[in-house]
Interface confidence: low
């Protein structure tokens, strides 16, 4: 299972995003996309 900080947030958010992760369904910028350095 995905266990990075990114993915933990993704599981809480529960919505697919085009960045390959998931995003919260609101307008507040949050760190929930596919982590990139």
């Amino acid at each position: 299972a995905c266990d990075t900080a990114t993915c933990v947030t993704h599981r809480l958010a529960g919505l697919l995003s085009r960045s390959g992760g998931v995003v919260k369904n609101n307008f507040v910028p949050t760190n929930v996309g596919s982590k990139a350095f």
Partner: antibody, heavy 122, light 107 residues
Framework: EVQLVESGGGLVQPGGSLRLSCAAS????????ISWVRQAPGKGLEWVAE??????????HYAEAVKGRFTISRDNAKNSLYLQMNSLRAEDTAVYYC?????????????WGQGTLVTVSS | EIVLTQSPATLSLSPGERATLSCKAS??????VSWYQQKPGQAPRLLIY???NRYLGIPARFSGSGSGTDFTLTISSLEPEDFAVYYC?????????FGQGTKLEIK
């Protein structure tokens, strides 16, 4: 203008300590996840440590090779990131880059510093 | 630890040609893959994140594809400034890992 400026590198003997700093400007530092990534001379990239944003409780994660020896921290009031490196080994010799990352959902921001060289040698 | 294997190690092409770089993960990483370009003496530069999303300001000739374990970076028509080392990375599991790099050189 966005800037990440690393400092604190230099020559240190095996077993010694160094504290790297990364000064950020031009963006809202406290919102960003920050990583240290290193590159040994002539080698590839290696992730070292990560500290999450203030809103994510500044949680930290480390590569196994540095766990227990390195400590990542941040001072959001000073827009600064730190890497305390103890018990240094020859294999820690590398250019150390700081990287800032923020995700808006539909886009991301990703910034790199130019790096600071750490040489561990007797 | 998830191992990323890039191929080829070196790719010799001419400007105007198409470049295809591969990155294979030892375990499934869904789409948690990014691609970076690095030139000598410079910091890495993010090109692609989320396997297929171009980062801000990255030219359209760069594209990424793949999911699961197999990923590809394609440069549709090489420009002189594209000759560099390219790395993939994964952020599906700690520790975050990078591939060993592909050197794209002028033929």
């Amino acid at each position: 203008e966005v800037q990440l400026v690393e400092s604190g590198g230099g020559l240190v003997q095996p077993g010694g300590s160094l504290r790297l700093s990364c000064a950020a400007s031009g963006f809202t530092f406290s919102n960003y996840w920050i990583s240290w990534v290193r590159q040994a001379p002539g080698k590839g990239l290696e992730w070292v440590a990560e500290i999450r944003s203030e809103s994510d409780a500044s949680a930290t994660h480390y590569a196994e090779a540095v766990k227990g020896r390195f400590t990542i921290s941040r001072d959001n009031a000073k827009n600064s990131l730190y890497l305390q490196m103890n018990s240094l080994r020859a294999e820690d010799t590398a250019v150390y880059y700081c990287n800032a990352y923020f995700d808006y959902g539909l886009a991301i921001q990703n910034y790199w510093g130019q790096g600071t060289l750490v040489t561990v040698s007797s | 630890e998830i191992v990323l294997t890039q191929s080829p190690a070196t790719l010799s092409l001419s400007p105007g040609e198409r470049a295809t770089l591969s990155c294979k993960a030892s375990k499934r990483v869904t789409t948690y893959v990014s691609w970076y370009q690095q030139k000598p003496g410079q910091a890495p530069r993010l090109l692609i994140y989320g396997a297929s999303n171009r980062y801000l300001g990255i030219p359209a000739r760069f594209s990424g594809s793949g999911s699961g374990t197999d990923f590809t970076l394609t440069i549709s028509s090489l420009e002189p400034e594209d000759f560099a080392v390219y790395y993939c990375s994964q952020s599906y599991n700690y520790p975050y890992t990078f591939g060993q790099g592909t050197k794209l050189e002028i033929k």
